[in-house]
């Protein structure tokens, strides 16, 4: 993981300021695979190469993000750069075979917190729910909410109940949940981050 991201970044950092501007404009109109959204114009136009790389990877994941970048570069007449990008992403990278993509809903959205991005995976994979509840009690969760989550019979149903309260949370509340996850199931956070 990360090879495609690095290859995208290398390609974008090698563009002139004018070419990067052209790249962004083409990105606004390039045909997208079904189920994938477009990066908002306002955010897109102000980005540098690093931010744009992160946004491409968060919106389209690494494999499709690299493919999309290569398509835009080709469309700009930068065939050699597009070829180098695709070669770099397939060089023993263990990249997913063409046509096999992670579902688009797992891609990050701008301004979407880590716990919102990975809601489904967290519901399915968090096992240490009681520990999370104790960490959040009094800071983020009321006594009533704490008891409601604890009353659920299984870990997934506990997490689903916990997530039923998150729409009312602000960013810092979500950060406290993330901190608790880092402390109790660090390997899971790492794994989700790599995805």
């Amino acid at each position: 993981m990360g090879r495609a991201r690095d290859a995208i970044l290398d390609a974008l950092e090698n563009l002139t300021a004018e070419e990067l501007k052209k790249f962004k404009l083409k990105l606004l109109s390039v045909p997208l695979r079904e189920g994938y959204g477009r990066i908002p114009r306002g955010a897109l136009l102000s980005m540098d190469a690093l931010d744009l790389t992160d946004k491409l990877v968060s919106f389209y994941l690494e494999t499709y993000g690299a493919e999309l970048t290569a398509n835009v570069l080709r469309d700009m007449g930068l065939q050699e750069m597009a070829g180098q990008l695709q070669a770099a992403t397939h060089q023993g990278s263990g990249a997913a075979p063409a046509g096999i993509q992670a579902p688009p809903q797992s891609a990050a959205k701008p301004g979407l917190h880590f716990i919102d991005q990975h809601r489904a995976a967290l519901i399915a994979r968090v096992t240490n729910v009681e520990w999370l509840l104790d960490a959040l009690y009094g800071k983020v969760l009321t006594d009533e909410q704490y008891q409601a989550v604890r009353a659920e019979p299984t870990n997934p149903s506990k997490m689903r109940k916990l997530f039923s309260f998150t729409p009312a949370w602000n960013w810092t509340c979500k950060d406290l949940l993330l901190q608790a996850l880092r402390e109790s199931q660090s390997y899971l956070v790492e794994d989700l981050e790599r995805s």
């Epitope: 301004g111 602000n170 960013w171 509340c173 901190q179 880092r182």
Partner: antibody
Framework: QVQLVQSGAEVKKPGSSVKVSCKIS????????IHWVRQAPGQGLEWMGY????????MYNEKFQGRVTITADKSTSTAYMELSSLRSEDTAVYYC???????????????WGQGTLVTVSS | EIVLTQSPATLSLSPGERATLSCHAS??????LSWYQQKPGQAPRLLIY???NLHTGIPARFSGSGSGTDFTLTISSLEPEDFAVYYC?????????FGQGTKLEIK
């Protein structure tokens, strides 16, 4: 490119307040957290807290709780850090910083302002 | 709060030598550690994040390793511009904290 430009140096009296600004450009202001870190002369770095301009929520280092207030003005893409009840030990360079990205599971500071020296002296 | 202790406080080496800087956390922080370089009158500069990931634009002579409570920043062959103060920072829990720094000076 991403830029964080801070306000100029300040000299303040003990007991007063200081408000330092950090003007952001080069990315969508509401998408990323902005943190404040200070450094006393010849000393190490100390995290003060952050704001998420998207919803205006802030988190503070408890050491400064009640004395520090971090705010953001979306209309000007500017973050502010106000420190009250100043004492001589608050003399430091105050930095605003932006993480590599905020939607990941951590905060590593890839972008920094140039720093603002605040001197507290009677 | 999590306390990060860096050692040594000062490291005196010559260009071309290998530098090894340590950072010890008071409790388990898994891999949530970064390293910064700071030169006089400048803001810190991110070198390594998540223990071992090299930040964009940082030369490959810098590398990071470790997990749990013990971490290392290695500079394989020192260049004149590498002499500076280095800080570690934990991202595991709030408040975020930094080590007290290691000053890397020319011998």
């Amino acid at each position: 490119q991403v830029q964080l430009v801070q306000s100029g140096a300040e000299v303040k009296k003990p007991g007063s307040s200081v408000k330092v600004s950090c003007k952001i450009s080069g990315y969508s202001f509401t998408d990323q957290t902005i943190h404040w870190v200070r450094q006393a002369p010849g000393q190490g770095l100390e995290w003060m807290g952050y704001i998420y301009p998207g919803d205006g929520s802030a988190m503070y280092n408890e050491k400064f709780q009640g004395r520090v207030t971090i705010t953001a003005d979306k209309s000007t893409s500017t973050a502010y850090m106000e420190l009250s009840s100043l004492r001589s030990e608050d003399t430091a360079v105050y930095y605003c910083a932006r993480p590599l990205y905020s939607y990941a599971s951590y905060y590593w500071f890839a972008y920094w302002g140039q720093g603002t020296l605040v001197t507290v002296s009677s | 709060e999590i306390v990060l202790t860096q050692s040594p406080a000062t490291l005196s080496l010559s260009p071309g030598e290998r530098a090894t800087l340590s950072c010890h956390a008071s409790q388990n922080i898994n891999v949530w550690l970064s390293w910064y370089q700071q030169k006089p009158g400048q803001a810190p500069r991110l070198l390594i994040y998540k223990s071992s990931n090299l930040h964009t634009g940082i030369p490959a002579r810098f590398s990071g390793s470790g997990s749990g409570t013990d971490f290392t920043l290695t500079i394989s062959s020192l260049e004149p511009e590498d002499f500076a103060v280095y800080y570690c920072q934990q991202g595991q829990s709030y408040p975020l904290t930094f080590g007290q720094g290691t000053k890397l000076e020319i011998k």
